[in-house]
């Protein structure tokens, strides 16, 4: 581990003396002197600082721009930034969630493996043998082929990854 520095945790070194850092939610107005303490002021409305700091300006809260499909997930405070997420049916294009894109739909022959969230896109998977999807959807999983046997029917047309089997009546045995 690094050896301790001349100033304690939550202090900083300026002009040969240790001054207290400003607490989260406050900005530096003036450094301490030999005779005075560090002077800090609370961040204004729509501003924040999330660490012990010596910043002279607070950061602006993130703006969740509805024109980019964004909405507020969690309102910012003087100590935290606003957290944006995407409107229903949309998801963030990056971890910072600066803009949104429409959830991807899974094409016929593919089903939804994982439904999209505000921060992740739809995950599709190809329908395996025995399953199908005949629609383009952001929600539908691959459906199993109909079991003709359980209906006392026979397969008249084989299923594919995009179509269900077609069942029909069994041929009558002639005497």
């Amino acid at each position: 581990p690094e050896p301790p520095t001349a100033c304690r945790e939550k202090q900083y070194l300026i002009n040969s003396q240790c001054c207290s850092l400003c607490q989260p939610g406050q900005k530096l107005v003036s450094d301490c002197t030999e005779f005075t303490e560090t002077e800090c002021l609370p961040c204004g409305e729509s501003e924040f600082l999330d660490t012990w700091n010596r910043e002279t300006h607070c950061h602006q809260h993130k703006y969740c721009d509805p024109n980019l499909g964004l909405r507020v997930q969690q309102k910012g405070t003087s100590e935290t930034d606003t957290i944006c997420t995407c409107e229903e049916g949309w998801h963030c294009t990056s971890e910072a969630c600066e803009s949104c894109v429409l959830h991807r739909s899974c094409s016929p022959g593919f089903g939804v493996k994982q439904i999209a969230t505000g921060v992740s896109d739809t995950i599709c998977e190809p329908c395996p043998v025995g399953f199908f999807s005949n629609v383009s959807s952001a929600f539908e999983k691959c459906h199993p082929w109909t079991s003709c046997e359980t209906k006392d029917l026979v397969v008249q047309q084989a299923g594919t990854n995009k179509t269900d089997v077609v069942c029909g009546p069994q041929d009558r045995l002639r005497a």
Epitope: P3, P4, A6, R8, I14, N15, S16, Q17, C18, T33
Partner: antibody, heavy 116, light 107 residues
């Protein structure tokens, strides 16, 4: 009255070490940082490092971190600087100073001469 | 590291003169500029801290000014005891650095 009394001049051999002392009086020793500097013959001043007598925490000038080691003894209100692996380039006057707003009070300096 | 430049390395003036010594920093040091006096016998004293604040016990004929990267020390009425070398030093960013010094002599 604030005073910093440094140890006397030293004549030392190349490759050896020397420990310079700086005894503080007239103020609360642990309330102020102690700064150390060097002045080579006919040259300006250069900062070596700083120590907090209350915690023992230090910051060094990268240039001197393998040369100088700063310590303090609270019981005697004394700061020390050990200089190691001395060469002729280390021949200089070494100063201690009390922090505050800048180097507020200075010791009288200690001349270290490195010579075979 | 921040470089402090004292362009005048030596200066001659007469007793009673107004003398100005300058110091330029390689970047903004937010007024954390201190001035020291080193007498011929080697003793060093703080004169001015934070650009313009007079250290306790320092005569009022010493004053400092400046901002950003340009700073100066003024002695308004030069006296014999002011014969010394004057150094500037920045306390804004580690490592602390000093100017090369300006040696003041009597004409």
């Amino acid at each position: 009255e604030v005073q910093l009394e440094q140890s006397g001049a030293e004549l030392v051999r190349p490759g050896t070490s020397v420990k310079v002392s700086c005894k503080a009086s007239g103020y609360a020793f642990t309330n102020y940082l102690i700064e150390w500097g060097i002045q080579r013959p006919g040259q300006g001043l250069e900062w070596i490092g700083v120590i907090n007598p209350g915690t023992g925490g230090t910051n060094y000038n990268e240039k001197f971190k393998d040369k100088a080691t700063l310590t303090t003894d609270k019981s005697s209100s004394t700061a020390y600087m050990q200089l190691s692996s001395l060469t002729s380039d280390d021949s200089a006057v070494y100063f201690c100073a009390r922090g505050g707003s800048g180097f507020a009070y200075w010791g009288q300096g200690t001349l270290v001469t490195v010579s075979a | 590291d921040i470089v402090l430049t004292q362009t005048t390395s030596s200066l001659s003036a007469s007793l009673g003169d107004r003398v100005t010594i300058s110091c330029r920093a390689s970047q903004d040091i937010n007024n954390y500029l201190n001035w020291y006096q080193q007498k011929p016998d080697g003793t060093v004293k703080l004169l001015i801290y934070y650009t313009s604040r007079l250290h306790s016990g320092v005569p009022s004929r010493f004053s400092g000014s400046g901002s950003g990267t340009d700073y100066s020390l003024t002695i308004s009425n030069l006296e014999q005891e002011d014969i010394a070398t004057y150094f500037c030093q920045q306390g804004n960013t580690l490592p602390w650095t000093f100017g090369g010094g300006t040696k003041l002599e009597i004409k």
